[in-house]
């Protein structure tokens, strides 16, 4: 059974993941329309369902494409460091949260970068609210 300390640690990690995803989404939405419309040409893969921590494997698999798109959009922009930091944070947090169990992602739809970040934000929020109730 999970101890209160491990539950607390998971909660903190989910809070951190949520924060980093929100930082990325804010960055995307802050781009002037000229950049955003071009970013929307890229597609990201979402699994059939995201309800458990092990499903974070599917987020991990999309982090490299996500970083590439954000870097392409930024070009020589000074925000590049923030993106790399957020992606790195997400990578570390996801590795801690998803556990060692191997999970095969079944992707069933492609979405834009905005939808992708919003869906994973919603996932974090739902897990956080479920574990705090």
């Amino acid at each position: 059974a999970p101890t209160s300390s491990s539950t607390k640690e998971t909660q903190e990690q989910l809070d951190q993941l949520l924060l980093d995803l929100q930082v990325l989404l804010k960055g995307v939405n802050d781009y002037k329309n000229s950049k955003l419309s071009r970013m929307l040409t890229f597609k990201f893969y979402m699994p059939k369902k995201v309800t458990e921590l092990k499903h974070l494997q599917c987020l991990e698999e999309e982090l490299k494409p996500l970083e590439e798109v954000l870097n392409l959009a930024q070009g020589k922009n000074s925000h590049g460091g923030n993106t790399r930091e957020s992606i790195s944070n997400i990578n570390v947090t996801v590795l801690k949260l998803k556990g060692s169990e191997t999970f095969m992602c079944e992707y069933d739809e492609t979405v834009t970068i905005v939808e992708f970040l919003n869906r994973w934000i919603t996932f974090c929020q739902s897990i956080i609210s479920a574990s705090s109730s």
Partner: antibody
Framework: EVQLVQSGTEVKKAGDSLKISCKGS????????IGWVRQMPGRGLEWMGT????????RYSPSFQGQVTMSADKSISTAYLQWGSLRASDTAMYYC??????????WGQGTMVTVSS | SYELTQPPSVSVSPGQTARITCSGD??????AYWYQQKSGQAPVLVIY???KRPSGIPERFSGSSSGTTVTLTISDVQAEDDADYYC??????????FGAGTKLTVLG
Amino acid sequence: EVQLVQSGTEVKKAGDSLKISCKGSGYNFDTYWIGWVRQMPGRGLEWMGTIYPADSDTRYSPSFQGQVTMSADKSISTAYLQWGSLRASDTAMYYCARFSSSAYDIWGQGTMVTVSS
Amino acid sequence: SYELTQPPSVSVSPGQTARITCSGDALPRKFAYWYQQKSGQAPVLVIYQDTKRPSGIPERFSGSSSGTTVTLTISDVQAEDDADYYCQSADRSDSYVFGAGTKLTVLG
């Protein structure tokens, strides 16, 4: 109603200069890319490039770089495509189109340009 | 330079289903868009982001994607669907490109 209205048919001689226009209405012209597309007689669509009217950021297809110039005057919601020296091979229909959510959702009616040698 | 490959022509009888494919190396990571162009008219967007249909486009038009190939499907084909169909996408460096186009002929 959201629309793009293009200037009329042009008949020119090789070596002439030309500037055709595309006027947007019914939406915030500044904040959407305007693309230009060429269609030679009996042929397919070719993407020439695109301009963002708010700051005139411009991207050209490698095939058209240096051959044409794209510009925009956001004060009158109009984008332009111009040639310094026309060739017979520039004979084509030219379309402007609005780029929204990464697709060209609104198209002008086209401007036919005929260049005689 | 980046290319999108389409069949030159597809022929179907009214009421049948037409499928037009478009292949390109970047399509696993870049959305595709489909345009219909009837003779003497400007192109019209019929599918965007692989599968989405703009308002005003009949439900008979649908899009799908698998790996490096996207497909435009027109079910219960009507005489008015007789047109050229172009796929469009962007390469990895964000330069846009159209396929060469597919002429859909509705027989009869």
